[in-house]
Amino acid sequence: GITSINCSGDMWVEPGEIFQMGMNVSIYCQEALKHCRPRNLYFYKNGFKEEFDITRINRTTARIWYKGFSEPHAYMHCTAECPGHFQETLICGKDISSGHPPDAPSNLTCVIYEYSGNMTCTWNTGKPTYIDTKYIVHVKSLETEEEQQYLASSYVKISTDSLQGSRKYLVWVQAVNSLGMENSQQLHVHLDDIVIPSASIISRAETTNDTVPKTIVYWKSKTMIEKVFCEMRYKTTTNQTWSVKEFDANFTYVQQSEFYLEPDSKYVFQVRCQETGKRNWQPWSSPFVHQTSQETGKRNWQPWSSPFVHQTSQTVSQVTAKSSHEPQKMEMLSATIFRGHPASGNHQDIG
């Protein structure tokens, strides 16, 4: 862009150098050249000479008019054609920008990942603004009334050391740019309610050689949270439908979960947990792939009837991908597994 330019005159923009995308814009060029009575004044946009909608207002000034200007950025400059000069003479230049006022930030969520030492807040910024937009995260103690403010783009990590004075906070995000300002809805946060347990990991799986082979999945977490509620989902790699099994977990020892699965099939397993009764889930763990052994005895296999699922499971639900084109987007067909909590953005789903 034209950040520093020695002008021999002036250039100005109406309604301003930053304006709303789609507006009509007038750019004026006024020369103040010594020893030159310009025959013509020329406008350039991004280095290309403009041909249309240019009006010579008087001897020193010209205007170019743009209907519905919709480029996010442009570099404008104007020149004069001086008699006796082979080259055009530069008068002045300006960077101009068009964009939108910010949308109100939405879907504000704050969580504390166990052991991270931070409260992480995220939100949706809405449609692109195309211009410099600041996001200010306000964190106000409901006990001391003191407010902290953090600059961010689409998320912020706030050290829990700075949240020592209180457990209850009001959090909101303010979006500000040259064209406007919007606030998100306020979020009431209790620090004890937003902790997500340390990551759960599936460490190994084995299939026994019994008459009815049984697959045991071993999984663990370093969480210090005592009451943890978990879900394990599983499916064959060729299938689009997940089954989900629920557990109350105690991570003082490695968890073992038993499954009766189709023989000679490749299965994908994932697990996620939350503090019992709380809202925020871990993201799904990395996919763990296990190949079940070949069937030893012949029998008629009916995967959706017992003993497909071990009887000690609390609930088994099915989760189906919306379409083969969108394997990342999963739709819960059974709400029971969510215990009334929304399936908030934690779907790191495998198709």
Partner: nanobody
Framework: QVQLQESGGGLVQPGGSLRLTCAAS????????MTWVRQAPGKGLDWVSG???????VYADSVKGRFTISKDNAKNTLYLQMNSLKTEDTAVYYC????????????RGQGTQVTVSS
């Protein structure tokens, strides 16, 4: 209550340096966002620089690369180091609580005069 007291202004030649200080009391300074704003003769308030509650700094284009904002939480003090001063930096400088935009800065001090002139 919140109290802010600026100092360190004065008369300086173009190209010179000054360090402004803002002594703060009456609130938890260590976790507060702070801003420097200025008012040139006959003009409105303009923000100069800000530092958020986590220490992230931001500067107006007109001072970027020349001014540096910093905080000493142990001393409850905000600083503005001003180098390569220009005549257009002449103004009364105020420190304020909060960040520069969207009416987020609340209370400001009495101000300190900075004059850049040859």
């Amino acid at each position: 209550q919140v109290q802010l007291q600026e100092s360190g202004g004065g008369l300086v030649q173009p190209g010179g340096s000054l360090r402004l200080t803002c002594a703060a009391s009456g609130f938890t300074f260590s976790t507060s966002a702070m801003t420097w704003v200025r008012q040139a003769p006959g003009k409105g308030l303009d923000w100069v620089s800000g530092i958020d509650s986590g220490g992230t700094t931001v500067y107006a284009d007109s001072v970027k690369g020349r001014f540096t904002i910093s905080k000493d939480n142990a001393k409850n003090t905000l600083y503005l180091q001003m180098n390569s001063l220009k005549t257009e930096d002449t103004a009364v400088y105020y420190c304020a609580t909060g960040l520069p935009w969207g009416n987020t800065w609340r209370t400001r001090g009495q101000g300190t005069q900075v004059t850049v002139s040859s």
